[in-house]
């Protein structure tokens, strides 16, 4: 079971300094971007990091969404990240949900954080680099100090 | 403004109930989780229970699980603390909070408290 | 769950700088950045200084800093004023079946 405790608006970046936000296509992908540009492609660049609690003792879980005309909410179903239509909802009666990760600080690197999937144990979000484009994807972590699925996260309220 | 306005605290007898008020303004109350805190007197702060924007989650201290029940009317912008068989060792002043868990927009706020006092 | 460790009493000088632990486990502080800091002089509500471990609300003064190592945060006080003298909290959302555990609390003296 998951309770939300409320929602912040966050910058997300890569470990590149790469900005995460939403294309035309609602893929969500990194860019270098400057201040200025973060804030000229806002609300693709701004996200909703809703806050949950669990029922276990699991950890800081969240949802992703993001406000366009419409608020959509990150999704790892099948272990293929897309952002589907619909608002974090208040509660969630079951122990996995494709919309929800558990946040976790970096061992040792308290400013880094890590996006574990409920549904997928070990599994991580991550960013990698297909042909030109950066992307948000699912990954198994499969070495320590893995900085692809590590990300810094900035508030913006 | 925001305001949170404790009611329902005063006197009981060990073994008694008493239901605590928390009535909020100047926010979306419905958006956050909310929190009740004590302070005994002359001790330092402990969280009692906690309650999800919706009201599905509660959440409570091992000293007042089973015995403390949280709940809210987010139509009448309430909060609410059951308390059940009431010890001495519950004397405190109770807080209304909405902690600031994270940087959201409106902030952290308290309620003045009510103190609850368990004697014979 | 436990409450985090502070230490009971600290004092300084005006002007001095002081620093007040606070010590948890990886199941609050060392887990997660969602550490704060209360000052509360007598008879009155908690007053938030720092959120986000690090991060100030706006009106607190920037005498005021957080930082966080492992299981450990800390609240630096630089500057003393007499009107720090007060008592501090620190705060942390827990992975346990609670949601918030507290610091035990730290007495400030201003000397």
């Known amino acids: 079971y998951f309770g939300k405790l409320e929602s912040k608006l966050s910058v997300i970046r890569n470990l590149n300094d790469q900005v995460l936000f939403i294309d035309q296509g609602n893929r969500p992908l990194f860019e270098d971007m400057t201040d200025s540009d973060c804030r000229d492609n806002a609300p693709r660049t701004i996200f909703i990091i809703s806050m949950y609690k669990d029922s276990q003792p699991r950890g800081m879980a969240v949802t992703i969404s993001v406000k366009c005309e419409k608020i959509s909410t990150l999704s790892c179903e099948n272990k293929i990240i897309s952002f589907k239509e619909m608002n974090p909802p208040d509660n969630i009666k079951d122990t996995k949900s494709d919309i929800i990760f558990f946040q976790r600080s970096v061992p040792g690197h308290d400013n880094k954080m890590q996006f574990e999937s409920s549904s997928y144990e070990g599994y991580f979000l991550a960013c990698e680099k297909e042909r030109d484009l950066f992307k948000l994807i699912l990954k198994k972590e499969d070495e320590l100090g893995d900085r692809s699925i590590m990300f810094t996260v900035q508030n913006e309220d | 403004e925001v305001q949170l306005v404790e009611s329902g605290g005063g006197l009981v007898q060990p073994g008694g109930s008493m239901r605590l008020s928390c009535t909020a303004s100047?926010?979306?109350?419905?958006?956050?989780?909310m929190s009740w805190v004590r302070q005994a007197p002359g001790k330092g702060l402990e969280w009692v229970s906690g309650?999800?924007?919706?009201?599905?989650?509660?959440y409570y201290a091992d000293s007042v699980e089973g015995r403390f029940t949280i709940s809210r009317d987010n139509s009448k912008n309430t909060l609410y603390l059951q308390m059940n068989s009431l010890r001495a060792e519950d004397t405190a002043v109770y807080y209304c909070?909405?902690?600031?868990?994270?940087?959201?927009?409106?902030?952290?706020?308290w309620g003045q408290g009510t103190l609850v006092t368990v004697s014979s | 769950q436990s409450a985090l460790t502070q230490p009971a009493s600290v004092s300084g000088s005006p002007g001095q700088s002081i620093t007040i632990s606070c010590t948890g486990t990886?199941?609050?502080?060392?887990?997660?950045?969602?550490v704060s800091w209360y000052q509360q002089h007598p008879g009155k509500a908690p007053k938030l200084l720092i959120y986000e471990v690090s991060h100030r609300p706006s009106g607190v003064s920037d005498r005021f800093s957080g930082s966080k190592s492992g299981n450990t945060a800390s609240l630096t006080i630089s500057g003393l004023q007499a009107e720090d003298e007060a008592d501090y909290y620190c705060?942390?959302?827990?992975?346990?079946?609670?949601?918030?555990?507290f610091g035990t609390g730290t007495k400030l003296t201003v000397l």
């Open positions: 705060s942390s959302f827990t992975s346990s079946s609670s949601l918030y555990v």
């Open positions: 909070a909405k902690p600031w868990l994270s940087g959201s927009r409106s902030g952290d706020f």
């Open positions: 309650i999800s924007t919706g009201g599905g989650g509660t």
């Open positions: 990886s199941s609050d502080v060392g887990g997660y950045n969602y």
């Open positions: 100047g926010f979306t109350f419905s958006e956050y989780a």
